[in-house]
């Protein structure tokens, strides 16, 4: 059920999850000069029942100067294909995303945590993209990618986000949108060119979902 690959890399864009499906693992990584405590957890695991999901295990880091032991904080080689590095994000999930049944919120930071988080995503996980600072997207609406299982293999849908130009950074879905400025900055820049591979046309009923130019006949 683990996704074999990382979410797609989009030029001038980053991604993050708004909530994490049960089964997702987060490596217990420590910043330089620190290591996991001896017998500490290798990872946190999103687990739960029908009514509540939470992260099992706690990550703990200690100064590596106190003991001369191996500082193994990354997955073993056979796990490497499952790892995905993202910049650490503060918990800012919109309620409707983070409260999804079977999903965990962004774990709070732990002391001396590494600056990047390495997640092992599972099938059904959705991530959202935004243009990095200095770039903006051609279309309005969220750009998302979903890990799907097809013919026994996992793959991520392609968001086709196009980030272009020297523009102000954008907001993720659920974050407060910047006010329109005299320069005419868009309401939302979390978007994509043609958007997801689902090729669904945006309707008012699905305005919060991924948008695209084509009708459902293109699914």
């Amino acid at each position: 059920e683990l996704c074999d690959d990382d979410p797609p890399e989009i030029p001038h864009a980053t991604f993050k999850a708004m909530a994490y499906k049960e089964g997702t693992m987060l490596n217990c990584e420590c910043k330089r000069g620190f290591r996991r405590i001896k017998s500490g957890s290798l990872y946190m695991l999103c687990t739960g029942n029908s009514s509540h999901s939470s992260w099992d295990n706690q990550c703990q880091c200690t100064s590596s100067a106190t003991r001369n032991t191996t500082k193994q904080v990354t997955p073993q080689p056979e796990e490497q294909k499952e790892r995905k590095t993202t910049e650490m994000q503060s918990p800012m999930q919109p309620v409707d995303q983070a409260s999804l049944p079977g999903h965990c919120r962004e774990p709070p930071p732990w002391e001396n945590e590494a600056t990047e988080r390495i997640y092992h995503f599972v099938v059904g996980q959705m991530v959202y993209y935004q243009c990095v600072q200095g770039y903006r997207a051609l279309h309005r609406g969220p750009a998302e990618s979903v890990c799907k299982m097809t013919h026994g293999k996992t793959r991520w849908t392609q968001p086709q986000l196009i980030c272009t130009g020297e523009m102000e950074t954008s907001q993720f879905p659920g974050e407060e949108k910047p006010q329109a400025s005299p320069e005419g900055r868009p309401e939302s820049e979390t978007s994509c060119l043609v958007t997801t591979t689902d090729f669904q046309i945006q309707t008012e009923m699905a305005a919060t979902m991924e948008t695209s130019i084509f009708t459902t006949e293109y699914q």
Partner: antibody
Framework: EVQLLESGGGLVQPGGSLRLSCAAS????????MHWVRQAPGKGLEWVSV????????YYADSVKGRFTISRDNSKNTLYLQMNSLRAEDTAVYYC???????WGQGTLVTVSS | QSVLTQPPSASGTPGQRVTISCTGS?????????VHWYQQLPGTAPKLLIY???ERPSGVPDRFSGSKSGTSASLAISGLRSEDEADYYC???????????FGGGTKLTVL
């Protein structure tokens, strides 16, 4: 059904001007960046210009920079291309396109000739 | 001269497999942008054939497939049919132009 319908093409003398329009329907026009792409007779496709969903930024191919202006009116679901200082080499079918572009109109012919 | 390079022509007999290449640069295909393919039948507007390197819109037969590697991409047509005779164009976003760039087109002839 997604539809893009171009109009405004025709015969114009070198140095003259034309304004092309593209009426869009069947999708949320205000959510998408739009393109103009042209095709000279017997030639390939050439991108002309793109405008963001809200019209706040625009880009042009070097061949038309300073002469063509792209704009849009989201309240009318319409895309425009103002073409000034037209040259013989601007003669082409002009397509309005949305997305990758993944949907195209049928095109309007612009002929620049004396 | 087109930013993306395609062979001007290709041909095959019915039932054969034909491949059309598309070569770009580090500012478009090589930068990680998706490649899209269009089919243009005589006298008609281009129609999206393959998007996101290898995805087919519904209605497009699975005889058409796409792939991408490095700064190049290719379109494969298997089980060639007479109705496949058309011009084929590849396209990708170009970060230096801030717009999509097209290949020069490949005229496919079914012998």
């Amino acid at each position: 059904e997604v539809q893009l319908l171009e109009s405004g093409g025709g015969l114009v003398q070198p140095g003259g001007s034309l304004r092309l329009s593209c009426a869009a329907s069947g999708f949320t026009f205000s959510s998408y960046g739009m393109h103009w792409v042209r095709q000279a007779p017997g030639k390939g496709l050439e991108w002309v210009s793109v405008i963001s969903y809200d019209g706040s930024y625009k880009y042009y191919a070097d061949s038309v920079k300073g002469r063509f202006t792209i704009s849009r009116d989201n309240s009318k679901n319409t895309l425009y291309l103002q073409m000034n200082s037209l040259r013989a080499e601007d003669t082409a079918v002009y397509y309005c396109a949305a997305g990758v572009p993944d949907y195209w109109g049928q095109g309007t012919l612009v002929t620049v000739s004396s | 001269q087109s930013v993306l390079t395609q062979p001007p022509s290709a041909s095959g007999t019915p039932g054969q497999r034909v491949t059309i290449s598309c070569t770009g640069s580090s500012s478009n295909i090589g930068a990680g942008y998706d490649v899209h393919w269009y089919q243009q039948l005589p006298g008609t507007a281009p129609k999206l054939l393959i998007y996101s390197n290898n995805e087919r819109p519904s209605g497009v037969p699975d005889r058409f497939s796409g792939s991408k590697s490095g700064t190049s991409a290719s379109l494969a047509i298997s089980g060639l049919r007479s109705e496949d005779e058309a011009d084929y164009y590849c396209a990708a976003w170009d970060m230096s132009l801030n717009g999509p760039v097209f290949g020069g087109g490949t005229k496919l002839t079914v012998l």
